[in-house]
Interface confidence: medium
Amino acid sequence: IAAHVISEASSKTTSVLQWAEKGYYTMSNNLVTLENGKQLTVKRQGLYYIYAQVTFCSNREASSQAPFIASLCLKSPGRFERILLRAANTHSSAKPCGQQSIHLGGVFELQPGASVFVNVTDPSQVSHGTGFTSFGLLKL
Amino acid sequence: IAAHVISEASSKTTSVLQWAEKGYYTMSNNLVTLENGKQLTVKRQGLYYIYAQVTFCSNREASSQAPFIASLCLKSPGRFERILLRAANTHSSAKPCGQQSIHLGGVFELQPGASVFVNVTDPSQVSHGTGFTSFGLLKL
Amino acid sequence: IAAHVISEASSKTTSVLQWAEKGYYTMSNNLVTLENGKQLTVKRQGLYYIYAQVTFCSNREASSQAPFIASLCLKSPGRFERILLRAANTHSSAKPCGQQSIHLGGVFELQPGASVFVNVTDPSQVSHGTGFTSFGLLKL
């Protein structure tokens, strides 16, 4: 069971990143699915290595004082959402914006029907060029 | 099937990074090989988690305005090269240069004879001290 | 065999990061253990994908000129410690400090009784908020 999906620009104001089965994507079988373009949902319980990469372009003056944060989050059936992993990068002073990349990855136990998704502080700063922003998992 | 190779300084003007089976490297068997010191080639079709880490030292004034970009690329037999993953970091203002590290990783389907390699915008900025820059894969 | 442990703030002056089995941690079985809150020790020989993520907050003026460095290190029975992976990030100019995240990961052969741990140049700069700093491995 494995998946690798590609970032998709979205006009939605939500902080949850959108993904698509496009380009050189992976979706090994129907035991993992991309739901609503925003979350990877697994049908089998087990240990999974889950990862996300987010490239963004921001400028210190044009952004809030808070850093850019990417969060890998889990929603299990009947449970509250929870943060699995986070990474933070202070905004660049480069003009008009400075690019930076964040990589998240870790091993987690997922229940049947569990979904994972990626949250960012400002989706408008995310880079959607080929290969820059992606999300995936693999069952151990 | 797994491999982990170590960066090798090279004066070649190519943007493709060079690697070596040295130090604490891994080459599990002959189903994955390091070819010409530049690409990992697999003999078996399947899903692979492929990763690369690149540490570089650059300065905003001494570098081009474009960011430092590391790309993980795929060359399948009879196909054009394609980018699998990219990461970008704006150059540092630190003198003489500021170090930064990039990590790339994702799950991809590889065909028999497929090769993966790592491209950077400026190989002369890459750090080759122990553990700073490496490249590998594992078959799921 | 898999583990994922969560960073723990420590008053110890050591550069070795401390970890805990808390929050959404993983410890698949007793073939991998967290020893002294600082190292993951494996009982079985084999290839492992080992990873660490460190988020830190630093300021160029308040820090030494040297960058922040995170090192993934190996201690095998009867052998000297050795560096497997390192990543470096120059300190931010943001006040009071600028957050940055480092991700390390690679495939390595471990012997029975081998331990892996994470070293940083300045543990006081490490961020211990939920999901920011973690460490784990999985056996291939």
Partner: antibody
């Protein structure tokens, strides 16, 4: 201030071995690559060997490859050059040198930002 | 590495010494007499140590590096070596040295 003090020079016989030691102070030794460079009488500078910050990566000049070993002790802030099977052409002044870029190693003679005073080696029967 | 064997200049003039044939970064090292310790003027192409006078500067274009001495002084009379990286051996390399004579 950065200081690099070499020792171990003197008269050596052909076929023998020498061990040069460089004691460093005034900087965080464990963060920098180090090099040995030599100069034969009346000649130019010649790269001998280089070692990275933690001692895991080394490189050697063509004239000494296979005969030389560079090593370091970060606890003692020393770097050592062992040269075996000495030849007359190994005669010269041996300088210890420090890389100028922290944690960045490429065995590159363009990185040197500080030099020792040198130790003279004579290989003669 | 290739550098001129000698250059000469009057006090106050600007001197440029070139070095080519390397592939990594270049450094410039001054040696006032044979056997005396070299002094780093420039490393990493254009970085000047804090104790070196600002009349010394370095630049690189392509694979050619240039050491510029603006307003040369009598005390600058010395041999100047460039250092760099050899692409075939993955090792350091030096030029043969340029003797600067101040007239």
């Amino acid at each position: 201030a950065v200081t690099l003090d070499e020792s171990g020079g003197g008269l050596h016989t052909p076929g023998g071995a020498l061990s040069l030691v460089c004691k460093a102070s005034g900087f965080t030794f464990s963060s920098y690559g180090m090099q040995w460079v030599r100069q034969a009488p009346g000649k130019g500078l010649e790269f001998v060997a280089a070692i990275d910050d933690d001692g895991s990566s080394t490189n050697y000049g063509a004239a000494v490859k296979g005969r030389a070993t560079i090593s370091r002790d970060n606890g003692q802030s020393t770097v050592r050059l062992q040269l075996n099977n000495l030849r007359a052409e190994d005669t010269g002044t041996y300088y210890c040198a420090k890389d100028g870029i922290i944690y960045y190693w490429n065995a590159d003679a363009g990185y040197i930002d500080a030099w020792g005073h040198g130790t003279e080696v004579i290989v003669s029967s | 590495l290739t550098q001129p064997s000698s250059v000469s200049a009057n006090p106050g003039e600007t001197v440029k010494i070139t070095c080519s044939g390397g592939s990594g970064s270049y450094g410039w090292y001054q040696q006032k007499s044979p056997g005396s310790a070299p002094v780093t003027l420039i490393y990493w192409d254009d970085e000047r140590p804090s104790d070196i006078p600002s009349r010394f500067s370095g630049s690189k274009s392509g694979s050619t590096a240039t050491l510029t001495i603006t307003g040369v002084q009598a005390e600058d009379e010395a041999v100047y070596f460039c250092g760099g990286y050899d692409d075939s051996s993955y090792a350091g390399i030096f030029g043969a040295g340029t003797t600067l004579t101040v007239l």
